[in-house]
Amino acid sequence: MRTEAQVPALQPPEPGLEGAMGHRTLVLPWVLLTLCVTAGTPEVWVQVRMEATELSSFTIRCGFLGSGSISLVTVSWGGPNGAGGTTLAVLHPERGIRQWAPARQARWETQSSISLILEGSGASSPCANTTFCCKFASFPEGSWEACGSLPPSSDPGLSAPPTPAPILRADLAGILGVSGVLLFGCVYLLHLLRRHKHRPAPRLQPSRTSPQAPRARAWAPSQASQAALHVPYATINTSCRPATLDTAHPHGGPSWWASLPTHAAHRPQGPAAWASTPIPARGSFVSVENGLYAQAGERPPHTGPGLTLFPDPRGPRAMEGPLGVR
């Protein structure tokens, strides 16, 4: 089970020259620590807007802030705790766009951002704070997803500010791609920390992070570094939850699924999650990028259902996950 820890906030040291110098030299490791976590980490932003002209019409805009090339974008209504949901559109840079009602018009705005208009006629529009999720599959970063929703009291024509959320499902390719940079930075960080080992430590206290404050998590390359580099989840408005008797966790997730904080809008999908997630014969939680197998009639090793999306231009093994499932 992964433990969560917040990066502590430094208390100002005692006044004086030594305090000032100590403050300066201690800030550097924390800056480096932040860089260690975020270096090379792409971000996905999501903006949800209700149109003033049609009260039940939404515009969803999503963008990818990363250097890699985008191979697929999936837009969906977010499901319970951000898992599952239902696909509204898939956009491929070369092979076109496919959408599902009530998606009316999905299009590329730039090479790294898309927009989707969702039509609604009162009855067909979901509740106002429904979560919309955008997932970008890119090379070499892997797969990144963020969600957003209208603020509870938003006026028509207004929109939630774009919500950057460098989360949650990074493929191994992305992790390995930045590990070199991370390794260098972290070695330097450890070197600095060792130099400060014999100095009196300043008083630390955990930061009081509001549940609504933006948070982020990046997958660390190893269990050892995970222990040192924990960052809390990105907080995203969860979708409105109808009264329901269903209490089973969807998709047969691992036992720690139940212990996730309620504001966490996504189940993490890093190597650890894959390793501990059973894949049933007709897999109930197979991420969309696993549908990216070549069109040669080849199915993934598990016969889980799913859209047969556009074949991946980088060949049949390009989207293989940590367990070899595609």
Epitope: P80, G84, T86, G120, P126, C127, T131, P242, G306, F310
Partner: antibody, heavy 120, light 107 residues
């Protein structure tokens, strides 16, 4: 065992409205889209639309946009389809069918069908 | 909308024979196609999903093939329980559409 139990046959007058229900059991209701399909006598199948029970969002075939309204009650685990301004053209068998949501694929379980007869 | 052309519309065959039903789509749907069987007075039952995968409990004498715009359902050594109607359906974007159906009758 997954089951979709639909309401019984309906005989209604032209111009009236009717509400057909589909009660689900044996699975987590909010995890799957519920689709509705029309089959006119001796003809093929026509997709009407779907509803995502988790958030109540629905998508419709444009041909049925002004004819059908889909709703759900997650507490009773039931999906509903209301058909309005009925004419003899609406006489058909109506099915509810479960579809995996995220993957957007096949209908793996179907209700037994509800026969609707519109006649004066 | 994606058009689904299914052929033949009807087929009269004997028990033990092999039949092939085809479904052609108006645009590339990759492998996003399902086949259903419907017996008189009953609801449709899933046979094949994702063009080639047999649904749970479906006998191995049924097989699906094809991708892109051309698909087929093959039934080897027909049995009496196989008679009825067969439909193809795409799920590559909405509106989902079905083929016109193939009625399989005993000769």
């Amino acid at each position: 065992e997954v089951q979709l139990q639909q309401s019984g046959p309906e005989l209604v007058r032209p111009g009236a409205s009717v509400r057909i229900s589909c009660k689900a059991s044996g699975y987590t209701f909010t995890d799957y889209n519920m689709n509705w399909v029309k089959q006119s006598h001796g003809k093929s199948l026509e997709w009407i639309g779907y509803i995502y029970p988790y958030n109540g969002g629905a998508g419709y075939n444009q041909n049925f946009k002004n004819k059908a309204t889909l709703t759900v009650d997650t507490y009773s685990r039931a999906a509903y389809m209301e058909l309005r301004s009925l004419t003899s053209e609406d006489s058909a068998v109506y099915y509810c069918a479960r579809e995996r949501g995220m993957q957007r694929d096949y209908f793996d379980y179907w209700g037994q069908g509800t026969i609707l007869t519109v006649s004066s | 909308d994606i058009q689904m052309t299914q052929s033949p519309a009807s087929l009269s065959v004997s028990v033990g024979e092999t039949v092939t039903i085809t479904c052609r789509t108006s645009e590339n749907i990759y492998s996003n196609l399902a086949w259903y069987q419907q017996k008189q007075g009953k609801s449709p039952q899933l046979l094949v999903y994702a063009a080639t995968n047999l649904a749970d409990g479906v006998p191995s004498r049924f097989s699906g093939s094809g991708s892109g715009t051309q698909f087929s359902l093959k039934i080897n050594s027909l049995q009496s329980g196989d008679f009825g109607s067969y439909f193809c359906q795409h799920f590559w974007g909405t509106p989902y559409t079905f083929g016109g159906g193939t009625k399989l009758e005993i000769k």
